[in-house]
């Protein structure tokens, strides 16, 4: 089958890194600099991606593969193949149209990207707040009061108050 296909279409013999050149009786010509073909049998080469401005070259373009970009420090990739670079914020902030803004009370962000998310509502799971939340960290939920059986309690209950001047019976 491969032999038949080759006889029918000489371009199928052209490997990655070349194109099937109609100007030269369909011989395989090398992709020109700043272009590539990642598959065989192509009739043109693809123009290499340019990593400019806020984009930084992670992998150079070769005759058989496109360049790959990432973002300069202070920015992070968004989209397939790092199609966009978005500004980093500090933990405890989110990016808005007006720049980085602190998370509102009751929300947190533990990353340099993304949005502020609400603290976990411990009471929805019947649990109590063990550690309070901050702008950078979610609350830590403790065991529910029902989980604390008298014998298993790790928290010592306070001693009953005694009235002054009275001795125990």
């Amino acid at each position: 089958f491969e032999r038949t296909r080759s006889l029918q279409d000489p371009c199928s013999n052209c490997p990655a890194g070349t194109f099937c050149d109609n100007n030269r009786n369909q011989i395989c010509s090398p992709c020109p600099p700043n272009s590539f073909s990642s598959a065989g049998g192509q009739r043109t080469c693809d123009i290499c991606r340019q990593c400019k401005g806020v984009f930084r070259t992670r992998k150079e373009c070769s005759s058989t593969s496109n360049a790959e970009c990432d973002c300069t420090p202070g920015f992070h990739c968004l989209g397939a193949g790092c199609s966009m670079c978005e500004q980093d914020c500090k933990q405890g902030q989110e990016l808005t149209k007006k720049g980085c803004k602190d998370c509102c009370f009751g929300t947190f962000n533990d990353q340099k990207r993304g949005i502020c998310r609400p603290w976990t509502n411990c009471s929805l799971d019947g649990k109590s707040v063990l550690v309070n939340g901050t702008k950078e960290r979610d609350v830590v939920c403790g065991p529910s009061p029902a989980d604390l059986s008298p014998g298993a309690s790790s928290v010592t209950p306070p001693a009953p108050a005694r009235e002054p001047g009275h001795s125990p019976q």
Partner: nanobody, 122 residues
Framework: EVQLLESGGGLVQPGGSLRLSCAAS????????VGWVRQAPGKGLEWVSA????????YYAESVKGRFTISRDNAKNTLYLQMSSLRAEDTAVYYC???????????????RGQGTQVTVSS
């Protein structure tokens, strides 16, 4: 009509130098992506060097880096390839090439001239 006329080739001893010229007509060289390809005896085409209009950045094949220099004279509409420290493996027909950009986003190249023969031999 677009034409590319190469000249400057010849017989040179190893270690010697040559300067190839490519006179362009029918288009403005300074507005185009252009370069040099070569074909050694019994071999396929190989890109040697290119100069890209966007910023004038240059490309050189690893085998010629540090030995060949591409340049252009916009006033004369001419492309040059200065070749020094020539080696036997540089023996080839050298063609001036012009990038051809296609509507679908692809790119190929065009060599309209007859090329100029460079032979490096003692």
């Amino acid at each position: 009509e677009v034409q590319l006329l190469e000249s400057g080739g010849g017989l040179v001893q190893p270690g010697g130098s040559l300067r190839l010229s490519c006179a362009a007509s029918g288009f403005t060289l300074s507005h185009e992506d252009v370069g040099w390809v070569r074909q050694a005896p019994g071999k396929g085409l190989e890109w040697v060097s290119a100069i890209l209009d966007s910023g004038g950045s240059t490309y050189y094949a690893e085998s010629v880096k540090g030995r060949f220099t591409i340049s252009r004279d916009n006033a004369k509409n001419t492309l040059y390839l200065q070749m020094s420290s020539l080696r036997a493996e540089d023996t080839a027909v050298y063609y001036c090439a012009r990038y051809v950009y296609h509507a679908g986003g692809g790119v190929t190249f065009d060599t309209r001239g007859q090329g100029t023969q460079v032979t490096v031999s003692s």
